[in-house]
């Protein structure tokens, strides 16, 4: 997999992984850490300053909207 992803490469990678539904650069509030004082981790920290994998990228995808009811 990639070593690190920064700038346009990171954006292209996120679009590829998430599709057109979009993505966050920071995890949504309340995502992951239970501590309110914990510094927010962003994708740049996780994938540009160090290497990350597909699973890590997927964590920053915007959620799917709920399926329409039958």
């Amino acid at each position: 997999g990639p070593e690190t992803l920064c700038g346009a490469e990171l954006v292209d990678a996120l679009q590829f992984v998430c599709g057109d539904r979009g993505f966050y650069f920071n995890k949504p509030t309340g995502y992951g850490s239970s501590s309110r004082r914990a510094p927010q981790t962003g994708i740049v920290d996780e994938c540009c300053f160090r290497s990350c994998d597909l699973r890590r990228l997927e964590m920053y995808c915007a959620p799917l909207k709920p399926a329409k009811s039958a």
């Epitope: 990639p2 998430c18 599709g19 057109d20 909207k65």
Partner: antibody, heavy 120, light 107 residues
């Protein structure tokens, strides 16, 4: 513009594997994401997975996870799709399809397709 | 996975007719739908992307509309070369999925 070139046909035995190639020429391989899409005879289109060749990021459809491997060789501008444990239901035309990076799934560029026939 | 349902599955029409093909998504996908044309023995060709944007080099008689879960491809005045199979595709979220196709035949 990039042209995607595929070989014509392969005949494989059930249980074997096939490796299909897709060579890009006449443009910048690095500016594309490559997906693999198959079409069984008389049927619709089915996305198998894709790769951004220069970044080495690969994403697979769950249906094919564990049975398909998508790779790319930057030095030859060639993408590959290997499908294992072939069965008769895998008989199909396998297309590589390119989308510009940032618009990975807008397939504005297609190979001519490789017909894979699985038969004993 | 997001299901894309196309209707009708086949359609007979005459040269000069205006035809519309509909595609419905199993969940809301904003405007992230593409339309392709495929002729026998050939690879698909991108006609419309992002629901309504015309791909470069494609005739302006093709147009796309819709958002959310319902999308349409319209051919304003059928030409002989338009008789083919048409597929919709969602790019909103992998796995990328396609409609089952609409075969457009000469009446």
């Amino acid at each position: 513009q990039v042209q995607l070139q595929q070989l014509g046909a392969e005949v494989k035995m059930p249980g074997s594997s096939v490796k299909v190639s897709c060579k890009a020429s006449g443009g910048t391989f690095s500016s594309y994401a490559i997906s693999w899409v198959r079409q069984a005879p008389g049927q619709g289109l089915e996305w198998m997975g894709g790769i951004i060749p220069t970044l080495g990021i690969v994403k697979y459809a769950q249906k094919f996870q564990g049975r398909v491997t998508i790779t790319a060789d930057k030095s030859t501008s060639t993408a590959y799709m290997e499908l294992s444990s072939l069965g008769s239901e895998d008989t199909a035309v396998y297309y590589c399809a390119g989308g510009p990076r940032g618009y990975s799934y807008n397939f504005d560029n297609w190979g001519q397709g490789t017909l894979v026939t699985v038969s004993s | 996975d997001i299901q894309m349902t196309q209707s009708p599955s086949s359609l007979s029409a005459s040269v000069g007719d205006r035809v519309t093909i509909v595609c419905r998504a199993s969940q809301t996908i904003s405007r992230y739908v593409n339309w392709y044309q495929q002729k026998p023995g050939k690879a698909p060709k991108l006609l419309i992307y992002a629901a309504s944007s015309l791909q470069s080099g494609v005739s302006s008689r093709f147009s796309g509309s819709g958002s959310g879960t319902e999308f349409a491809l319209t051919i304003s005045s059928l030409q002989p070369e338009d008789f083919a199979t048409y597929f919709c595709q969602q790019t909103y979220s992998p796995p990328i999925t396609f409609g089952q196709g609409t075969r457009l035949e000469i009446k």
